[in-house]
């Protein structure tokens, strides 16, 4: 059994989240994850889910009674989701920490927007896929 | 030329983000995107980047002078990143809108944590990949 299981059960007690009524009105994450089989689609969703948990854990970082459980779960998330790759984890954390209300951050984000957009679709990576996609989709008026 | 280019240039003027000094102290997103070639890694990062832009655009939704530019860029993001898949976009939006301070959301998130964790690594999907990954990583103390 993975280490996180015991610690997650501990968190369930702490948050009073073991009761069946918690499942009322549908799920937060599980229903959404069921919709996506493609690895790249799953990563889009899991990226948001993982950042949610990290934010949640941050809010409880001073609570000693669940400190060990939180740390163990975060370690396991780092192994499972980031494949123990510290650079991947660091880059992810940088992105989640940018403040959308910081004027310098806003200016940089807008400055980079065209290049970010150009890289958004997988098609942007290879000319061949781009071309076939365009033939398939129909021509764009702007092209 | 894609429609977003002209509109992004318009936003650059509005945010005063065309000056060379904007690039001082490194990039927000471009440097990070350069680090990741694997499609699934890119999606992890792009998921955070796209949610940042959507948040940023939301903050300026009442500013009529950039309304058309923002709408056009969002349209193009929906095509490029979500492949015009409304369900993908809706699921993504649900995830970004969950409040980490809402007690019911916290309870649900902890309730679902074990199952979310079990699905985090691609390895969870196929036994073969799981085995090779374990050999690569070395044995975990718990195994």
């Amino acid at each position: 059994q993975d280490p996180y299981v015991k610690e997650a059960e501990n968190l369930k007690k702490y948050f009073n989240a073991g009761h069946s009524d918690v499942a009322d009105n549908g799920t937060l994450f599980l229903g959404i994850l069921k919709n996506w089989k493609e690895e790249s689609d799953r990563k889009i969703m899991q990226s948001q889910i993982v950042s949610f948990y990290f934010k949640l854990f941050k809010n409880f970082k001073d609570d000693q009674s669940i400190q060990k459980s939180v740390e163990t779960i975060k370690e396991d998330m780092n192994v499972k989701f980031f494949n123990s790759n510290k650079k991947k984890r660091d880059d992810f954390e940088k992105l989640t920490n940018y403040s959308v209300t910081d004027l310098n951050v806003q200016r940089k984000a807008i400055h980079e927007l065209i290049q970010v957009m150009a890289e958004l679709s997988p098609a942007a990576k290879t000319g061949k896929r781009k071309r076939s996609q365009m033939l398939f989709r129909g021509r764009r008026a702007s092209q | 030329q894609d429609p977003y280019v002209k509109e992004a240039e318009n936003l650059k003027k509005y945010f005063n983000a065309g000056h060379s000094d904007v690039a001082d102290n490194g990039t927000l997103f471009l440097g990070i995107l350069k680090n990741w070639k694997e499609e699934s890694d890119r999606k992890i990062m792009q998921s955070q980047i796209v949610s940042f832009y959507f948040k940023l655009f939301k903050n300026f939704k009442d500013d009529q002078s950039i309304q058309k530019s923002v709408e056009t860029i969002k349209e193009d993001m929906n095509v490029k990143f979500f492949n015009s898949n409304k369900k993908k976009r809706d699921d993504f939006e649900k995830l970004t809108n969950y409040s980490v301070t809402d007690l019911n959301v916290q309870r649900k998130a902890i309730h679902e944590l074990i199952q979310v964790m079990a699905e985090l690594s691609p390895a969870a999907k196929t036994g073969k990949r799981k085995r090779s990954q374990m050999l690569f990583r070395g044995r975990r103390a718990s195994q």
């Epitope: 398939f136 764009r140 | 894609d2 058309k68 349209e75 015009s84 409304k86």
Partner: antibody, heavy 122, light 110 residues
Framework: EVQLLESGGGLVQPGGSLRLSCAAS????????MSWVRQAPGKGLEWVSA????????YYADSVKGRFTISRDNPKNTLYLQMNSLRAEDTAVYYC???????????????WGQGTLVTVSS | NFMLTQPHSVSESPGKTVTISCTRS????????VQWYQQRPGSAPTTVIF?????PSGVPGRFSGSLDSSSNSASLTISGLQTEDEADYYC?????????FGGGTKVTVL
Amino acid sequence: EVQLLESGGGLVQPGGSLRLSCAASGFTFSSYAMSWVRQAPGKGLEWVSAISGSGGSTYYADSVKGRFTISRDNPKNTLYLQMNSLRAEDTAVYYCAKDLTVGGPWYYFDYWGQGTLVTVSS
Amino acid sequence: NFMLTQPHSVSESPGKTVTISCTRSSGSIVSNYVQWYQQRPGSAPTTVIFDDDQRPSGVPGRFSGSLDSSSNSASLTISGLQTEDEADYYCQSYDSSNVVFGGGTKVTVL
């Protein structure tokens, strides 16, 4: 109340041209992608073309690519379909349809016009 | 390209329930929304179900939509069938630049 009213249909010879219009009212036209969907006599529905709300991006079914051009005039709340090099198999009722949600095209429709009949025959 | 396959026709007596299936040939039915349109003879289509299972305002509660991932299909159920429900019904979905309609199902109220 959302209303879509197509016009411009009629009888045309093979190889000929026709321009369809769709006058829209009751919603913020420029916020929604729009599509043309056709239905051959006694047949099912076939998507033809779409255009983003801003008008900057257009999309076509393979069957009409290079022959049809979709466009819109947002100040006039009007959608167009320019049809060139028409063939017998283009004979159909042509509907304009509004996207369900802003930010598209999402290719799901909540309102349709009453349709205009295009007949291609010699 | 995927296809959406519907039964050609179904018929039932007033007050009864009919279910129309819409089976996706490839790709997952749950990874894209399914929409259902009603088309009465000589009229334009109208939406009866959007986003898999949502009803537009004005559409009676007798209409419901669902997905079944095990059969990779969507279903439209009309309960308490009425004479005005007699029409053609089309399912529709979208994936990777393909806008796909089912072939349509003619519902006859006996």
